[in-house]
């Protein structure tokens, strides 16, 4: 929801968390502001305190329940409001009717591990975290490998167009240190975006056997 120079963006992690960022040019840093969540068809509501993340933007996480509980469904609509204290009263700064499953950003994949490593290849697996059972297998992944002397931004993206929680990296250099990251995105949702990248997994390929043609 955009109002003049105000921007209010939220994402649902598909289970029990809505993360919001509100930015407003010229807003006072010391103003106390909150995000209020009012689902249209639930008995609960939730509030979180917006905390500054930069000169003109604030963020907070609406914790709706235990991490793996399914707190919202595909038909819920949540009214989200930014409320800021002005003296003794609260003023509404931004509002949006939020469709959780149109605005998804999952948690970063976790539990990355090397399943098997050789001189030229490495098999890596991971797990998705706090992802709704709604998605069945309809998720996609992007992965990238950091090679020596390069940056993450230079790393080519590998796309996995299905729910495949492993990858076999090929054509690696023997006895070389690499890092690997992966992120996930559901197919569902007009404004859905990629999860954050996972924590990098460091691994080293095996050295080539002496006297062998590699």
């Amino acid at each position: 929801a955009v109002n003049g120079t105000s921007r209010f963006t939220c994402f649902y992690n598909s289970r029990a968390n809505i993360s919001c960022v509100w930015s407003q040019d010229g807003a006072l840093q010391d103003t106390s502001c909150q995000v209020h969540a009012w689902p249209d068809r639930r008995r609960w509501n939730q509030t979180c305190e917006l905390l500054p993340v930069s000169q003109a933007s604030w963020a907070c996480n609406l914790i709706l329940g235990t991490p793996d509980s399914q707190k919202l469904t595909a038909v819920d609509i949540v009214t989200l409001r930014v409320m800021c204290r002005e003296g003794v009263r609260w003023r509404m700064m931004a509002i949006q009717d939020f469709k959780p499953f149109e605005n998804l950003r999952l948690m970063a994949p976790i539990s990355l591990q090397v399943v098997h490593v050789e001189t030229h290849r490495c098999n890596i697996s991971w797990k998705i975290s706090q992802a709704s059972h709604y998605f069945e297998r309809h998720l996609e992944f992007e992965a990238r490998t950091l090679s020596p002397g390069h940056t993450w931004e230079e790393a080519p993206l590998m796309t996995l167009k299905q729910k495949q929680e492993w990858i076999c990296l090929e054509t690696l250099t023997p006895d070389t240190q690499y890092e690997f990251q992966v992120r996930v995105k559901p197919l569902q949702g007009e404004f859905t975006t990629w999860s954050p990248w996972s924590q990098p997994l460091a691994f080293r390929t095996k050295p080539a056997a002496l006297g062998k043609d590699t």
Partner: antibody, heavy 117, light 107 residues
Framework: EVQLVQSGAEVKKPGATVKISCKVS????????IHWVQQAPGKGLEWMGW????????EYAPGFQDRVTITADTSTDTAYMELSSLRSEDTAVYYC??????????WGQGTTVTVSS | EIVMTQSPATLSVSPGERATLSCRAS??????LHWYQQKPGQAPRLLII???QSISGIPARFSGSRSGTEFTLTISSLQSEDFAVYFC?????????FGQGTKLEIK
């Protein structure tokens, strides 16, 4: 292999209630959604509702809300759809289907319900 | 509720030719549109999700596209087993609704 096997054809009188079962196998029933869809002759497909076995919640289409009840028995991996106050226009094939909320990935074979006096 | 209108109601095409089926939503539904195939005496089968994503196991000759509120299912080279009824379904606004179907018959 994913399978949904429905109970057999039913003949009912107007005003009666019908209860159809849908026995599933090949996937984790406790983490699934089971939908029910009506296909009346010459009327196309109508989505009736779902049960979310993990969240323990049901969702019904407004057109069926007053007369339909969807339940599940997780001990037998079976979903049920009960339709009450039957009328002649409820004569149809009823399907159960597995899916996320948004679309129906696997379907049962269908159960024909005939409402006739 | 959103009304899904499919056209034509019946489409006659020769085997080996291309078939184009249309589905129009009465309001904007983003890409929340799914296609099913139903053969006589059988349950529907999911073909395409979110307007253009093929389901695994579905032949590559089936493809989907979108232009605004109009969605198209294209079968590039019709096989005998493709003659059936095709339904679209929206999942943007509750309750989910289906089109009335397009019957694809042999010319």
């Amino acid at each position: 292999e994913v399978q949904l096997v429905q109970s057999g054809a039913e003949v009912k009188k107007p005003g009666a209630t019908v209860k159809i079962s849908c026995k599933v196998s090949g996937f984790n029933f406790k983490e699934s959604l089971i939908h029910w869809v009506q296909q009346a002759p010459g009327k196309g497909l109508e989505w009736m509702g779902w049960i979310d076995n993990e969240a323990g919640e049901t969702e019904y289409a407004p057109g069926f809300q007053d007369r339909v009840t969807i339940t599940a028995d997780t001990s037998t991996d079976t979903a049920y759809m009960e339709l009450s106050s039957l009328r002649s226009e409820d004569t149809a094939v009823y399907y159960c289907a597995r899916g996320g909320p948004w679309f129906l990935s696997y379907w049962g074979q269908g159960t024909t319900v005939t409402v006739s006096s | 509720e959103i009304v899904m209108t499919q056209s034509p109601a019946t489409l006659s095409v020769s085997p080996g030719e291309r078939a184009t089926l249309s589905c129009r939503a009465s309001q904007i539904i983003s890409n929340n549109l799914h296609w099913y195939q139903q053969k006589p005496g059988q349950a529907p089968r999911l073909l395409i999700i979110y307007g253009l994503q093929s389901i695994s196991g579905i032949p590559a000759r089936f493809s989907g596209s979108r232009s605004g509120t109009e969605f198209t299912l294209t079968i590039s080279s019709l096989q005998s087993e493709d003659f059936a009824v095709y339904f679209c379904q929206q999942s943007n606004n509750f309750p989910w609704t289906f089109g009335q179907g397009t019957k694809l018959e042999i010319k």
